[in-house]
Interface confidence: low
């Protein structure tokens, strides 16, 4: 189960929740977002305050890591296995460091299986950052600093940190080093949402949430 | 003395393909973003891609991404400006530029003296 | 992309005038901006870097101000060498330069 499936069963409060995986008794913790636009959504990725490394291999990206309640990575098998049971939106909020908000919606979003290097499927932008995809399209296999899936002679993970679904590099990476305001311009292997702020403007924070089409 | 010579300027056909060369000296080249950027005859100056100090990161001007690639050889001090289908529009002085960043990519500080490209039938 | 776009793109001008010449940025470039000095026939000449540090070895009637998307150069008392076209470069999202302001004698 999923937030979604938390809030119709009556939880509408914000908080952590124990999910669990699709046609398994496997429990994953997770934070709900029961408020943002009605509700219902599972937060998969959360950057804050920098407070959690996001340097991790591919092991740790695959089963998460971080604080639910603070910055984290909820881990790419789970929502693998949730995004190929039925249909999902992908919504990222970004915040940068002059007190401004935009975000991505994609009306439809999965991820391929672990033997698929967790290669990422989007349809559908909406959203006020930006016109064109951040992330790039078609959408490309996740990257590692120990799995390097991406289009680069070089090794994208390495070089820009952070997991993400590299291309050669690309214009996104949210699991990039985290920098203080006033350090945060023209740092490329910050957090970094092209077609909003730029390739060298490292965003304050970031959250990507998914949540059933239907629901 | 920091000094960029570029080389390799010549006059090519449309379609054709050319590779510049840019030899530096007078300063640690392993240590800085190195970039090419160009000047139409009696226009003005055009970024056209640059390169990361280990040369694992690359950025291009949008009309001549899969057409330009850069690279460098720090061992000898060289940058490269490979030049494929080439048009009429890239008609230009390919200056060798320093970008003054270590950490971050900012302004050029240092200037080669140029190298035409001339690109005609 | 970020568009700089310089005004006036000729200034005629005499010896011991102030000039002042003007780069704007579609969007925010925070102070991520240069100033360049090109003569004919010769590469550009970087003068001032984030909108307002003056390079090594520039003269001080050269100075740079503004932030965000309003930037000025001034040259407080033109010189006989100052006649020259002048660029402005963002270097905040790529690396992109104004079209020039060329800066002649009146």
């Known amino acids: 189960r999923d937030c979604a499936e938390v809030f119709k069963s009556g939880h509408t409060t914000n908080g952590i929740y124990t999910l669990t995986f699709p046609n398994s008794t496997e429990e994953i913790k997770a934070y709900c977002d029961m408020e943002a636009g009605g509700g219902g959504w599972t937060i998969i990725q959360r950057r804050e305050d920098g407070s959690v490394d996001f340097q991790r291999t591919w092991k740790e990206y695959k089963v998460g890591f971080g604080n639910p309640s603070g910055e984290y990575w909820l881990g790419n098998e789970f929502v693998s296995q949730l995004t190929n049971q039925q249909r999902y939106v992908l919504k990222i909020h970004l915040k940068d460091w002059e007190g401004n908000e935009a975000y991505s919606l994609y009306e439809h979003f999965y991820l391929s299986s672990e033997e698929l290097n967790y290669r990422i499927h989007l349809k559908g932008l909406t959203g006020t950052a930006g016109k064109i995809s951040s992330i790039s399209q078609p959408g490309n296999d996740f990257s590692t600093k120990d799995g390097d899936n991406d289009k680069c002679i070089c090794k994208c993970s390495q070089m820009l940190t952070g997991g993400w679904w590299f291309d050669a590099c690309g214009p996104s990476n949210l699991n990039g080093m985290y920098y203080p305001q006033r350090q945060n311009t023209n740092k490329f292997n910050g957090i970094k949402w092209y077609y909003w702020k730029g390739s060298g403007y490292s965003l304050k924070a970031t959250t990507m949430m998914i949540r059933p089409a239907d629901f | 003395e920091v000094q960029l010579v570029e080389s390799g300027g010549d006059l090519v056909q449309p379609g054709g393909s050319l590779r510049l060369s840019c030899t530096a000296s007078?300063?640690?080249?392993?240590?800085?973003?190195m970039t090419w950027v160009r000047q139409a005859p009696g226009r003005g100056l055009e970024w056209v891609a640059n390169?990361?100090?280990?040369?694992?990161?690359?950025y291009f001007l949008d009309s001549v991404k899969g057409r330009f690639t850069i690279s460098r050889d720090n061992a000898k001090d060289l940058l490269f400006l490979q030049m494929n289908s080439l048009r009429g529009e890239d008609t230009a002085v390919y200056y060798c530029?320093?970008?003054?960043?270590?950490?971050?990519?900012?302004?050029?500080?240092?200037w080669g003296q140029g190298t035409l490209v001339t690109v005609s039938s | 992309d970020i568009q700089m776009t310089q005004s006036p793109s000729t200034l005629s001008a005499s010896v011991g005038d102030r000039v002042t010449v003007t780069c704007r940025a579609s969007?925010?470039?925070?102070?991520?901006l240069a100033w360049y000095q090109q003569k004919p026939g010769k590469a550009p000449k970087l003068l001032i870097s984030?909108?307002?540090s003056l390079e090594s070895g520039v003269p001080s009637r050269f100075s740079g101000s503004g932030s965000g998307t309003e930037f000025t150069l001034t040259i407080s008392s033109l010189q006989p060498d100052d006649f020259a076209t002048y660029y402005c470069?963002?270097?905040?999202?790529?690396?992109?330069f104004g079209q020039g302001t060329m800066v002649e004698i009146k």
């Open positions: 530029v320093r970008d003054r960043g270590i950490e971050v990519a900012g302004p050029f500080d240092y």
């Open positions: 007078g300063f640690t080249f392993s240590k800085y973003w």
């Open positions: 390169i990361k100090e280990d040369g694992n990161e690359k």
């Open positions: 969007q925010t470039i925070i102070n991520w």
């Open positions: 984030k909108a307002s």
């Open positions: 470069q963002q270097y905040n999202r790529y690396w992109t």
